[in-house]
């Protein structure tokens, strides 16, 4: 997250983290149900773990945290690498969630966010694109939803329904490290970090996020039937 | 199948400008999950990374030559460029251009598809 | 910069043997940002391994990376008669440099 701020302690307790090997963040995800993530489905990788409940970078234990395996991870149908549409993945986790203050699914949003609707992206990702600086806690950062047309001015031809362009003035933006995190609008799950420019925080290159809203039914159709 | 070639002029004085051209085939530049770089080796030496173009046009220099270099796209021919001036024999070398992937995950992916490399000689 | 030194300079081993190349970083490096390069004579370098342990797509599995920090190794198994060849370490944690390379020759 580039020119955000440190996320207040458990204020984001659906983020999660997934790890290569020991403790290597290379995604965020997001807690949807007591035993299901989402992420973007260009966060991939056979073998990973989750964190869950934990507010700083480093692997220190934290006592909120829980840690998972994934046992399935199901990327959207309509998914191909390396294009962005429909990039979002289920990850299904070995067990289920012991509920707590730290840790705690969010609700989906059934309706599209609108142009101008404030929301919070949130992730472990750099805090400066060119040279890489990773902080120390999660870091929070509004962001506004922008109108589809800005979004397509901003990347032509590369604009579908799956996603949406959210940011603000020049210096904000999600980053590298980001990717699969939420983008949460009044209280709900609206998007996750997907795509966008590089470096990050350009001017009229916004961040392009998994446009959730139009998911919803494939997502709970995938859960139930596994 | 992705493939890229390098062109340009074998032999280049030493002050004059270095004028290479990579010609991307099988795929399109215009992409938001790749970028394109140029990397150079030296007769019998290591490689060096010169620098990188994203899909805006925005461009990533290696400090070392960053007031010597400029790299540029052609999306209509889908081409990229690469322009090195005041060039010395130390500017000798083997140059090659390259595609890497890049995304908002954490992840470098490295460059996986390489051109064949074209030989540039600085002499008078 | 962040400089990367390879070492040993030059393996001499025999085919069917395990090599063990080493790439030390002058600062620490986040593993997710380094990469392994193979060169044969006269050919570009092929990628390997990214993210310090990830096979590259067709990279055959006796080929693995490891490492954290400031050190980091690219193992190959059992060398076949084709992996003879030089290997190039890279760092893009920072401005992207490569290590002087190690050359894997027959013995």
């Known amino acids: 997250i580039v020119n955000g701020s440190d996320c207040q302690k458990d204020a984001q307790p659906w983020q999660g983290a997934l790890l290569l090997g020991p403790n290597k963040l290379y995604c965020g995800a997001v807690l949807i149900s007591p035993q299901w993530l989402l992420t973007a489905a260009h966060c991939r990788k056979p073998v990973f773990r989750i964190r869950l409940g934990h507010h700083s970078m480093s692997p220190v234990y934290e006592s909120g945290q829980q840690m998972f395996q994934g046992i399935k991870s199901i990327p959207h149908p309509g998914y191909s690498h390396p294009g962005h549409s429909n990039d979002l993945m289920l990850i299904k986790m070995n067990r289920k969630i012991r509920d707590s203050h730290s840790v705690k699914p969010v609700e989906i949003a059934c309706d599209c966010a609108t142009e101008g609707t404030r929301c919070m992206v949130s992730g472990w990702g750099t805090t400066s694109s060119s040279h890489n600086n990773f902080p120390k806690v999660l870091q929070c950062l509004n962001i506004t939803v922008l109108s589809e047309e800005r979004c397509k001015n901003s990347y032509p031809g590369q604009i579908d329904k799956t996603m949406f362009c959210a940011g603000d003035e020049e210096g904000r933006d999600s980053c590298q490290g980001d990717s699969g995190g939420p983008v949460v609008c009044n209280g709900k799950l609206q998007g996750l970090v997907s795509w966008g420019d590089f470096p990050c925080a350009q001017r009229n290159r916004p961040g392009v996020y998994t446009n959730l809203c139009e998911f919803v039914k494939w997502i709970k159709d995938t859960m139930n039937s596994n | 199948q992705l493939q890229l070639q390098e062109s340009g002029p074998g032999l280049v004085k030493p002050s004059e400008t270095l004028s290479l051209t990579c010609t991307v085939s099988g795929g399109s530049i215009p992409s938001s999950s790749y970028y394109w770089a140029w990397i150079r080796q030296p007769p019998g030496k290591g490689l060096e990374w010169i620098g990188n173009?994203?899909?805006?046009?925005?461009?990533y220099y290696n400090p070392s030559l960053k007031s010597r270099v400029t790299i540029s796209v052609d999306t209509s021919k889908n081409q990229f460029s690469l322009k090195l001036s005041s060039v010395t024999a130390a500017d000798t070398a083997v140059y090659y251009c390259a595609r890497g992937e890049y995304d908002r995950s954490a992840l470098y992916y490295g460059m996986d598809v390489w051109g064949q490399g074209t030989t540039v000689t600085v002499s008078s | 910069e962040i400089v990367l030194t390879q070492s040993p300079g030059t393996l001499s081993l025999s085919p069917g043997e395990r090599a063990t190349l080493s790439c030390r970083a002058s600062?620490?490096?986040?593993?997710?940002?380094l990469a392994w390069y193979q060169q044969k004579p006269g050919q570009a370098p092929r990628l390997l391994i990214y993210g310090a342990s990830s096979r590259a797509t067709g990279i055959p599995d006796r080929f693995s990376g490891s490492g954290s920090g400031t050190d980091f190794t690219l193992t190959i198994s059992r060398l076949e008669p084709e992996d003879f060849a030089v290997y190039y370490c890279?760092?893009?944690?920072?401005?992207?440099?490569f290590g002087g390379g190690t050359k894997v020759e027959i013995k």
């Open positions: 890279q760092q893009a944690f920072s401005s992207p440099t």
């Open positions: 600062q620490s490096v986040s593993s997710s940002y």
């Open positions: 173009i994203y899909y805006s046009g925005s461009t």
